[in-house]
């Protein structure tokens, strides 16, 4: 489409025919009026005129005459100063200059807002030589103008190292309002004021703003752009947009959702990843965050064994990663586990509770009343003990581990023996004579080895020495008994 243009500055008439601002359709007027310059409707002529190939910036032949000694200063002819058109129209404008033939090597370039236009733009320069002067018309055309084409265009001519600059041609592309700032989605606290901003520009100006909340206008009277809407507070989610109006019509911004911050939804899918005797590794899937970032989470652990206290342990942890290792648990116990997370508004409800169990643990107490003595043959050390008072939580007793350390001058060696759970006595061979044997015993379950009993020492004499006196675990308070023979 060929655009209409309005002349804002009123230059001299360019053509004897139609008035400026109307569509120019006389294709031959350019040939008959070589000195013409100014706005031309788009797509008026082909790049080259018949009979005159396009030569671009050519060297103009020197022509001397008596009248050329006092040449007037070179200047571009006055042209249309301001072109107003709608977006997506085509436009063409030009500047013209008559150059005496004595000048050579002329070039014309187009500039927009101080920057030279190079490359892809559609610029054509045509030459119309006469006896003494050559009329040069430089045309610039834009197809489907956009707002980015707005600006001040000038022609520049370099001639004999001098620069001649045309008057500016202002291109004003008008259209519907264009948003430079639209309202943004927000998450807000219930009943708390907040602001939304909307800014739109023309041309044409002015641009007026109406605010819309949930499809209903908020302000009866428009506000000039930019506009800030102060919302005193919301109790439920709302969608806001703004309408920008100018002489060309109306543009509506994107609709933005204003969410009300709430407590999060409870976490889901609490899962057990690993259980040990005293710890459980869990993970969970966070619930909806309530439009406010999670701050932290709370793992709640409740004893559920039939006669347990039911004590509730609460472990606070960061919101991510969504995993936590619960520690300090009893062995072989059942627990109910739930997770709750919080944001700035508050705590979520607790996730669905899941049941988890710890595994068997090592015994927590050592065997009691450990007694050690030499038998008559002196080849064996006889060890006796009492079964520890273990809670079943420690796991099923599978046996005992006996440590016996033999020490004499320059020798120290430790040996370990394993015996079954039904035993409460064991015999070990004498390893070294004239030495001290130190015995400790630990209970063993599938969960591991428990603590060793206090050491009991017995002296093993050289051959030929017999003594039946036992050595035993001391009464509480005696840390390191030694049987002296």
């Amino acid at each position: 489409a060929i655009t209409e243009a309005r002349e804002e500055a009123k230059p001299y008439p360019l053509f004897p025919g139609p008035l400026p601002g109307s569509l120019q359709t006389d294709h031959t007027s350019l040939l008959s009026l070589p000195h013409t310059s100014g706005y031309q409707p788009a797509l008026m002529f082909s790049p080259t005129q018949p009979g005159r190939p396009y030569t671009g910036n050519v060297a103009i032949p020197r022509v001397t005459s008596a009248g050329s000694k006092l040449l007037p200063p070179l200047a571009f002819k006055h042209t249309v100063g301001h072109i107003i058109l709608s977006e997506h129209k085509d436009v063409k404008f030009n500047c013209s200059i008559s150059v005496p033939n004595i000048y050579q090597d002329t070039t014309i370039s187009w500039w927009k807002d101080g920057k030279e236009l190079l490359g892809a733009h559609h610029a054509i320069t045509q030459f119309y030589p006469d006896d003494e002067v050559t009329a040069i018309i430089a045309s610039f055309s834009i197809t489907s103008v956009q707002r980015s084409d707005n600006g001040s265009y000038i022609c520049k001519m370099k001639i004999n190292n001098e620069e001649i600059v045309s008057d500016p041609i202002y291109i004003e592309v008008q259209g519907l309002p264009h948003f430079t700032k639209q309202p943004e989605s927000m998450n807000v606290t219930r009943n708390t004021a907040f602001n939304l901003t909307c800014q739109a520009v023309g041309p044409p100006e002015p641009v007026n703003i109406f605010w819309v909340q949930n499809s209903s206008r908020v302000n009866e009277q428009p506000e000039k752009s930019p506009s800030v809407l102060t919302v005193p507070g919301l109790t439920e989610m709302a969608v806001f947009s703004c309408e920008a109006h100018n002489d060309k019509g109306l543009t509506v911004s994107k609709g933005v959702q204003i969410n009300i911050k709430a407590i999060p939804s409870p976490p889901t899918e609490v899962s057990i990843h690993n259980s040990t005797a005293h710890s459980i590794l869990i993970s969970w899937v966070p619930g909806f965050d309530g439009y406010s970032p999670f701050r932290n989470c709370s793992v709640q652990v409740k004893e559920v064994d039939p006669l347990s206290n039911g004590s509730v342990m609460i472990f606070n942890t960061s919101a991510s990663p969504h995993m936590y290792q619960i520690k300090q648990l009893q062995a072989l116990a059942n627990y109910s586990i739930g997770v709750s997370c919080m944001n700035e508004i508050g705590w979520s409800a607790v996730s669905p509770w899941i049941l988890a169990s710890t595994t068997e643990g090592a015994p927590s107490v050592a065997p009691l009343n450990v007694t050690v003595f030499l038998n008559e043959s002196r080849d064996n050390v006889d060890i006796r003990w009492m079964k520890p008072l273990t809670k079943r939580q420690a796991g099923e007793l599978v046996g005992y581990r006996i440590s016996h350390v033999w020490q004499s001058a320059g020798i120290s060696k430790e040996l370990l023996e394993e015996v079954g759970q039904n035993n409460s006595r064991a015999q070990i061979s004498v390893q070294v004579h004239n030495a001290t044997c130190t015995v400790r015993i630990a209970a063993v379950t599938k969960g591991g080895v428990g603590p060793f009993s206090d050491p009991v020492k017995i002296f093993i004499p050289a051959h030929g020495w017999v003594d039946h006196a036992p050595s035993s675990t001391p009464a509480p308070g005696n840390a390191d008994p030694v049987l002296i023979i």
Partner: antibody, heavy 117, light 107 residues
Framework: QVQLQQPGAELVKPGASVKVSCKAS????????MHWVKQRPGQGLEWIGR????????NDNQKFKGKATLTVDKSSSTAYMQLSSLTSEDSAVYYC??????????WGQGTLVTVSA | ETTVTQSPASLSVATGEKVTIRCITS??????MNWYQQKPGEPPKVLIS???SLRPGVPSRFSSSGYGTDFVFTIENTLSEDVADYFC?????????FGSGTKLEIK
């Protein structure tokens, strides 16, 4: 120190309901199971059920399903047991109990519920 | 449900004698057996809890043994103040179940 306060006695008519209370003090109410136990005169003990005030989880003895309903009021640290459709078989002493360290360590003094026309 | 069978229902001993009460359970309960004493007009009092653990403050003349299904409660050197009803309670599984009780008298 831990205390569980129960009313001494309740007299109710057959077919009616009664709500026995147990006010806890001296410990964190929401941290421990609360059990209820029935003892008929001159007879043994029967476990009715338990409730956890933290999240009101309950475990009931099937024998008392429909008969006993356990609730709590966290704000007053009080546990309740409602007995419905009462008959002479429900005449008994009802104890609230909390376990500690693997045993029923703390008992209320018991509420004697008498069902009589 | 684990049933608990307690015997005897009653017994009478002279002071200084040994008392033995037995509870047998219908399922293996490990060592989750508890023993209670109840005097007239009072709530029961725990003497021994799970794992044959004597409760703090309970005289050492009270003891228990057993694991699995067979449990024994013993009072050595019975005193007149031991006159009471004695109950066992299994705490391995829900519902918790009590023995029927043993009434102890002094001759």
């Amino acid at each position: 120190q831990v205390q569980l306060q129960q009313p001494g006695a309740e007299l109710v008519k057959p077919g009616a309901s009664v709500k026995v209370s147990c006010k806890a003090s001296g410990y964190t109410f929401t941290n421990y199971w609360m059990h209820w136990v029935k003892q008929r005169p001159g007879q043994g003990l029967e476990w009715i059920g338990r409730i956890h005030p933290f999240d009101t989880e309950t475990n009931d003895n099937q024998k008392f399903k429909g008969k006993a309903t356990l609730t709590v009021d966290k704000s007053s640290s009080t546990a309740y047991m409602q007995l419905s459709s009462l008959t002479s078989e429900d005449s008994a002493v009802y104890y609230c109990v909390i376990p500690a360290n693997g045993g029923f360590a703390y008992w209320g003094q018991g509420t004697l519920v008498t069902v009589s026309a | 449900e684990t049933t608990v069978t307690q015997s005897p229902a009653s017994l009478s001993v002279a002071t200084g004698e040994k008392v033995t009460i037995r509870c047998i359970t219908s399922t293996d309960i490990g060592d989750d057996m508890n023993w209670y004493q109840q005097k007239p007009g009072e709530p029961p009092k725990v003497l021994i809890s799970e794992g044959n653990s004597l409760r703090p403050g309970v005289p050492s003349r009270f003891s228990s043994s057993g694991y699995g299904t067979d449990f024994v409660f013993t009072i050595e050197n019975t005193l007149s103040e031991d006159v009471a009803d004695y109950f066992c309670l299994q705490s391995d599984n829900l519902p918790l179940t009590f023995g029927s009780g043993t009434k102890l008298e002094i001759k």
